[in-house]
Interface confidence: medium
């Protein structure tokens, strides 16, 4: 039977009355246009909604925007457009919300053609009040907050100037000209690239990488011949042009650019690209594009210094620079990532890793599903997940996969069951164990969201027709109840819930359309009365993550340790609550070969845990560049996986000798790097 129709599905008692009392409608006094929504702060209940309406006239576009504020999670909204002097706000810059709970908001206004600079509206009290500030420049990008200090802002101007404010946008100073890209690093450091000869595009591959650690008082050139740069975890990456040809290589620094090492990754040509797929303080997933317009490349995983890389996954789907990849970090379980590969017959298949890229496998076929037309063998196939690429291809996939760190083990995604991703209308699948096993949760495409740290899942059918029904589940998607939230169906445009999945409120956004008018409308439903009591100790059960063989002493060991979680029982209908903290008990595992990646010059044959020497490197000395010196590597082929905490057990030998030879590649060697002060 279909999910939610089993006899054992108990109904939540009196839910219609409970939800009806907690359903709040707000009709916005607006022509339809577009709407954007931002949450201000965490657990504050403050939402800002910006509606914009463009009237294209013959000579120019006349625009009108309205700003609304809610402080009760969207149940009620107040029109606060007068606080921004009824100014038209530029939607392409969005609403720049400050980090953490700073309560800061910056809105960028549309200004008339001849003005000297742009205009912003600033709030530091969760949008209760705004201050208008005229800028001495026209912004090219949204204001970027320093992660460490929300009073520090940076922005690029349309003239390629780098502007900094130290007092939350009150006063601005241009600290450098001819800037292409600027990013905040740690400790209020700014990294940026500059051009010398004309433009960012013309100088691509000849840019300089600069650093300022004092907001523009002094500068240091930390790299030359730069194509681009990126930050990931504690790593600073730069792609650098080779001396002799048009290829470029990745260099990496872990000390803010003072010293650099050449990453042991293939160089790429003009038409290729590198992409940091994911990074944390331990390691990096790097995609290296294949030559030619193939649409795929190779994923490499780094060691703890970001220098030595192991091949992780071949034929990884990634269409073009800035294009589409399905690479997804499953945040509800440590070490799990999902992505797509392009097979030889040009079909697309989903792969999953449970050990941070060490090994990839297909997703297990859901028990309650049959193989579709893509399957050669109707009894053997896998689940394939729709993500960014499917969405870009305009398939009937309204949402990417969803997981939340505090909803342990839960992954929700659209998928198809066969030998490859199908273009047929997908269904929605759920995993409650971080991707090891899957169940069909809903027939056909849906929007979905997680509330109360997994205590409630909410879904709305994806339809071109107006809707008035929402579905919800209190048992991780096994059984579903439907609630009609309005008599008059609306054209649905989106589900909004507070980031972090701790809230019990969901807002359904859409518009009503009558013969003459079209208005934005939101329905906010509070589920607090469905989960009418707080969860107690008896509502939780112990769950061992990554468990595949309970008989095995090492069961659950991933990256050198296992974790037991306290998880809400599916049968318990209670509130985790806003203050819910995931309870986990880690324990260290003995080291096995699974805790080691293959070292530089080694690889793992399929279905083998041993690392063997790459044939082309047999008998060669293994030398690589580290901190600008050539190093000789003595290894029996293994290196500890970054972040792996195992102890004892197997312990392969690994030693690195300094060859005392320079190998700075195209970078200025540290002693020659120049500094200057303003």
């Amino acid at each position: 039977s279909a999910p939610g129709e089993d006899e054992e599905c108990g109904r939540v008692r009196d839910f219609v009355a409970k939800l009806a009392n907690n359903t709040h409608q707000h009709v916005f006094d607006d022509l339809r246009g577009s709407v954007s929504l931002s949450w201000v702060g965490d657990s504050t209940g403050v939402i800002l909604v910006l509606t914009t309406f463009h009237v294209p006239l013959v000579i120019m576009t006349f625009g009108q925007s309205k700003l609304y504020r809610s402080e009760d999670y969207g149940k009620n909204f107040k029109d606060i457009t007068d606080l921004i002097n009824n100014t038209f706000i530029r939607t392409e810059f969005g609403m720049a919300i400050g980090p953490e709970n700073s309560g800061k908001v910056v809105l960028t206004a549309e200004v008339s053609g001849g003005s000297r600079g742009g205009r912003i509206f600033r709030s530091s009290d969760f949008a209760k009040n705004f201050v208008q500030t005229d800028l001495p420049f026209h912004p090219l990008t949204q204001m970027m907050y320093s992660p460490q200090n929300s009073d520090y802002l940076l922005a690029l101007s349309t003239e390629n100037g780098l502007w900094v404010s130290k007092n939350f946008g009150g006063k601005w100073e241009e600290i450098h000209k001819a800037v292409c890209l600027a990013k905040w690093g740690s400790d209020n450091t700014i990294f940026f690239t500059t051009y010398a000869n004309g433009s960012c595009k013309a100088d691509l591959g000849a840019l300089e990488l600069w650093r300022t650690s004092d907001l523009g008082k002094s500068f240091k050139t930390i790299g030359v011949k730069i194509y681009s740069f990126g930050l990931g975890g504690r790593f600073l990456f730069a792609s650098v042009m080779a001396d002799k040809d048009t290829t470029r290589r990745i260099h990496v620094s872990t000390d803010q650019g003072d010293t650099w090492s050449m990453a042991q990754l293939p160089s790429v040509g003009q038409e290729q690209f590198y992409s940091i797929l994911a990074a944390n303080d331990d390691m990096v997933f790097m995609h290296v594009d294949e030559p030619g317009d193939t649409g795929f490349g190779t994923i490499f995983t780094s060691d703890d210094r970001g220098i030595v890389y192991s091949k992780s996954l071949d034929r990884h789907l990634y269409t073009t620079t800035g294009g589409e990849t399905d690479f997804t970090n499953v945040t509800s379980l440590r070490g799990v990532y999902i992505t797509s590969v392009l097979s030889e017959d040009n079909s697309i298949q989903t792969m999953i890793t449970f050990d941070q890229g060490g090994r990839w496998t297909h997703l297990r076929k859901p028990e309650n599903s049959e193989c579709d037309a893509t399957a050669k063998n109707k009894n053997e196939c896998s689940l394939h997940i729709h993500a960014s690429y499917s969405i870009s291809q305009k398939l009937n996939v309204p949402m990417a996969p969803l997981s939340e760190p505090n909803a342990v083990g839960i992954v929700i995604a659209h998928g198809s069951v066969g030998d490859a991703i199908s273009v047929m209308v997908p269904d929605v699948y759920i995993s409650d164990d971080g991707g090891y096993s899957w169940t069909k949760m809903l027939e056909g495409p849906h929007y979905y969201t997680i509330l109360d740290s997994g205590g409630i899942i909410v879904a709305i059918e994806h339809s071109s027709r107006p809707i008035n029904v929402i579905k919800f589940s209190t048992d991780e998607g096994q059984c579903w109840q439907t609630y009609t939230f309005t008599r008059d169906p609306i054209y649905f445009t989106g589900l909004a819930s507070e980031p972090g999945a701790r809230s019990m409120n969901i807002s359904i956004w859409g518009f009503t359309e009558s013969f003459l008018t079209s208005q934005w409308v939101s329905y906010t439903i509070d589920f607090k009365d469905i989960l009418e009591r707080n969860c107690e100790e008896k509502d939780y059960t112990i769950w061992l993550a990554h468990s595949t063989d309970p008989e095995d002493y090492e069961d659950g060991c991933i990256l050198g340790y296992k974790e037991q979680f306290l998880r809400l029982r599916k049968s318990s209908v209670c509130q985790n609550g806003r203050d819910y903290v995931v309870t986990k008990q880690p324990s260290i595992c003995l080291c096995s070969l699974e805790d080691f990646l293959c070292d530089f010059g080694y690889y793992r044959p399929e279905n083998d845990s041993k690392c063997v020497e790459q044939p082309e490197l047999k008998g060669h000395d293994l030398e690589f560049c580290l901190y600008g010196r050539e190093e000789h590597l003595t290894t029996n082929g293994y290196r500890k996986i970054p972040g792996d905490k195992c102890q004892g057990g197997v312990n392969p030998v690994r030693e690195v000798k300094d060859l005392k030879k320079k190998c700075t590649s195209n970078f200025l060697s540290p002693e020659k790097q120049n500094s200057k002060s303003n």
Epitope: D293, N346, L395
Partner: antibody, heavy 129, light 107 residues
Framework: QVQLVQSGAEVKKPGASVKVSCKAS????????MSWVRQAPGQGLEWMGI????????SYAQKFQGRVTMTRDTSTSTVYMELSSLRSEDTAVYYC??????????????????????WGQGTTVTVSS | EIVMTQSPATLSVSPGERATLSCRAS??????LAWYQQKPGQAPRLLIY???TRATGIPARFSGSGSGTEFTLTISSLQSEDFAVYYC?????????FGGGTKVEIK
């Protein structure tokens, strides 16, 4: 086993309409598109259109636009093809065919086509005054 | 629409011989091409999909090749049951279109 069973032969007068049914069994009905193809006596195959059983969206060949309507009933796993304003040149055998059109999402280079892998036995429609 | 042209219209071959059938598209259809066999009084039967992949249960003597605009169906050693009409069909762009067919007859 997987099969498509079509309704019986029809004799119609010019200007009338005909509705041919095609009942699917042995597979999940909603997972495959269905195409309709016709073949006039002694002639080749001519594609008429395609229907997606989920949602019922359709795409018709220009030649039949305005005269053909394809529908489906998911409760009985049946698709229907109705052709109106019949003329003598509509005399033909009409086939439904399961069409896993582009069912494997292909990479950037191209889509991948699986072909019409299961066909109905055909329904003969004769238009004669 | 994409026009599919098959040649020859009729091919006379002796049993055991090799038969080569051609199909040309008026514009590129990539590998989105299928071949069908039809015997008198029967529905068509899928032989090849994706230009070169044999459908389930199709003998190895049938093979398809080509990509873009030029395609070939080869029957390596004709058996008596292979004498029939063969159609190619593209599914690159709607509407799907068939070639006019090639009749393979006994010489």
């Amino acid at each position: 086993q997987v099969q498509l069973v079509q309704s019986g032969a029809e004799v119609k007068k010019p200007g009338a309409s005909v509705k041919v049914s095609c009942k699917a069994s042995g597979y999940t009905f909603t997972k495959y598109y269905m195409s309709w193809v016709r073949q006039a006596p002694g002639q080749g195959l001519e594609w008429m259109g395609i229907i997606n059983p989920i949602g019922g969206s359709t795409s018709y060949a220009q030649k039949f636009q305005g005269r053909v309507t394809m529908t489906r009933d998911t409760s009985t796993s049946t698709v229907y093809m109705e052709l109106s304003s019949l003329r003598s040149e509509d005399t033909a055998v009409y086939y439904c065919a399961r069409d896993p059109f582009g069912i494997a999402l292909a990479g950037p280079a191209s889509r991948y086509y699986y072909g019409m892998d299961v066909w109905g036995q055909g329904t003969t429609v004769t238009v004669s005054s | 629409e994409i026009v599919m042209t098959q040649s020859p219209a009729t091919l006379s071959v002796s049993p055991g011989e090799r038969a080569t059938l051609s199909c040309r598209a008026s514009q590129s259809v990539s590998s989105n091409l299928a071949w069908y066999q039809q015997k008198p009084g029967q529905a068509p039967r899928l032989l090849i999909y994706g230009a070169s992949t044999r459908a389930t249960g199709i003998p190895a003597r049938f093979s398809g090749s080509g990509s873009g605009t030029e395609f070939t169906l080869t029957i390596s050693s004709l058996q008596s049951e292979d004498f029939a009409v063969y159609y190619c069909q593209q599914a690159r762009l709607g509407p799907w279109t068939f070639g006019g067919g090639t009749k393979v007859e006994i010489k």
